[in-house]
Interface confidence: medium
Amino acid sequence: AGVFELQIHSFGPGPGPGAPRSPCSARLPCRLFFRVCLKPGLSEEAAESPCALGAALSARGPVYTEQPGAPAPDLPLPDGLLQVPFRDAWPGTFSFIIETWREELGDQIGGPAWSLLARVAGRRRLAAGGPWARDIQRAGAWELRFSYRARCEPPAVGTACTRLCRPRSAPSRCGPGLRPCAPLEDECEAPLVCRAGCSPEHGFCEQPGECRCLEGWTGPLCTVPVSTSSCLSPRGPSSATTGCLVPGPGPCDGNPCANGGSCSETPRSFECTCPRGFYGLRCEVSGVTCADGPCFNGGLCVGGADPDSAYICHCPPGFQGSNCEKRVDRCSLQPCRNGGLCLDLGHALRCRCRAGFAGPRCEHDLDDCAGRACANGGTCVEGGGAHRCSCALGFGGRDCRERADPCAARPCAHGGRCYAHFSGLVCACAPGYMGARCEFPVHPDGASALPAAPPGLRPGDPQRYL
């Protein structure tokens, strides 16, 4: 037995263009909640298939109202963990679906309205008792950051939570036939004492005092053979004395649990309680060892010679996780300097440098002006990874090779005519205007209209200018 725990860190717009609109508005304030669905194994399963390992809903998050015109920020999250208890062994390999739901709190007829904002899914390997694993998943323009782990509930221990441990009764060693519970060397495997009278041939127990039946047997002590032909009433209950099976398809009909597992019905499906050394939805999987190839992405498996001992995956560069299942996002450390573009090729990291920079991490600033001449007396100016020429009067272009036409920009105002000259340009002003660019009107009496009114005169009244 144990608990799968999920911690949501953030839910908000992902990187890149196309930021999503805020899911809430002043007219329709809303709050978020999350649903997690767990399934055993690594198979691609439809989103609608049952959450055979369990499911959980979070509490509702704080109410959020969009600020008009603001982009959608990371949205306020519910407090606490999402916890999915598992009663039996942890399967080691699992699939997950995490859904982000929006609860609209406007004046809804018949209560709040819910809508699915985003759904992410993945397949992972995870040993119980290990550290928190971090993950980032994207759904459209949204990004969800979360961590998860599986932990055993005492007295269960091990990577699958299948071994039961008790504190040592004697300081030196464990009882006869009982091993220490590595890594908890101060504890020993607990002797299992089943319910008194539990059939040794057809029953077994995983917890002291219980009696679970093997396939084909029933009754409180697993002494009654199951018979499907002795049902008298089509709607009668299951009988321990006759061994009659409940009619109508039920989750435990036919006992879907292999390897001596016992079946019990749950709200959405069934649960198999597996004997020691087996796990999975139907107790069909024995303990993972290196022979099962648990390490992904070329990881090297060490240890795990027997089902009760752990294995360790030594991951190649670029991968991490207890099963090397997670690619390390090495670009998130921003190793490329001077605005270089980071490319994680898996086997190596590459930086694509901006012009004017070089080196494995774009750390070298090239001498932009080295070997570059500016013609016609221009001088080279370095900057921003590209060279630029500051040209002498009368020349232009990237390398000052083009003869500039100073009159091209029509610099003379008020109809003045422009003449190119070796020292620049000259404006011949139209009547009534003066100045280097013909920018000042000339008053009829010959005084120039200055750009500011003299003291004592109101600006904006040209008739009063002297």
Epitope: P234, V246, C257, R268, R282
Partner: nanobody, 126 residues
Framework: EVQLVESGGGLVQPGGSLRLSCAAS????????IGWVRHAPGKGEELVAR????????RYADSVKGRFTISADTSKNTAYLQMNSLRAEDTAVYYC???????????????????SGQGTLVTVSS
Amino acid sequence: EVQLVESGGGLVQPGGSLRLSCAASGFNISHYSIGWVRHAPGKGEELVARIYPTNGYTRYADSVKGRFTISADTSKNTAYLQMNSLRAEDTAVYYCARHHYSHYDGHSHYYGLDYSGQGTLVTVSS
């Protein structure tokens, strides 16, 4: 397209009654087990009741036995949950759910909830 649409929820006083309906489309309820699952704030899901319309077999959670009755009308492809003697702890969102049942590896069966509706809110309060 498989669809389950619940109706009949609402506000009722303790001791009162409500009848929830679940209209199914896109499949024949006779071929499946139909259940009502409820989810209350801060609690896990609970399978309240389940019916196999083909032979009328029903199953109830201990917490509702004697108070709730599940039924089905195969001609209308609809399931019902009659809820009497309602208590405050019955307050929850009630989902109608289809449970599928298919052969697995030659001898046993795979069973589980594969579709559910959007839910209807039942509030028991004075």
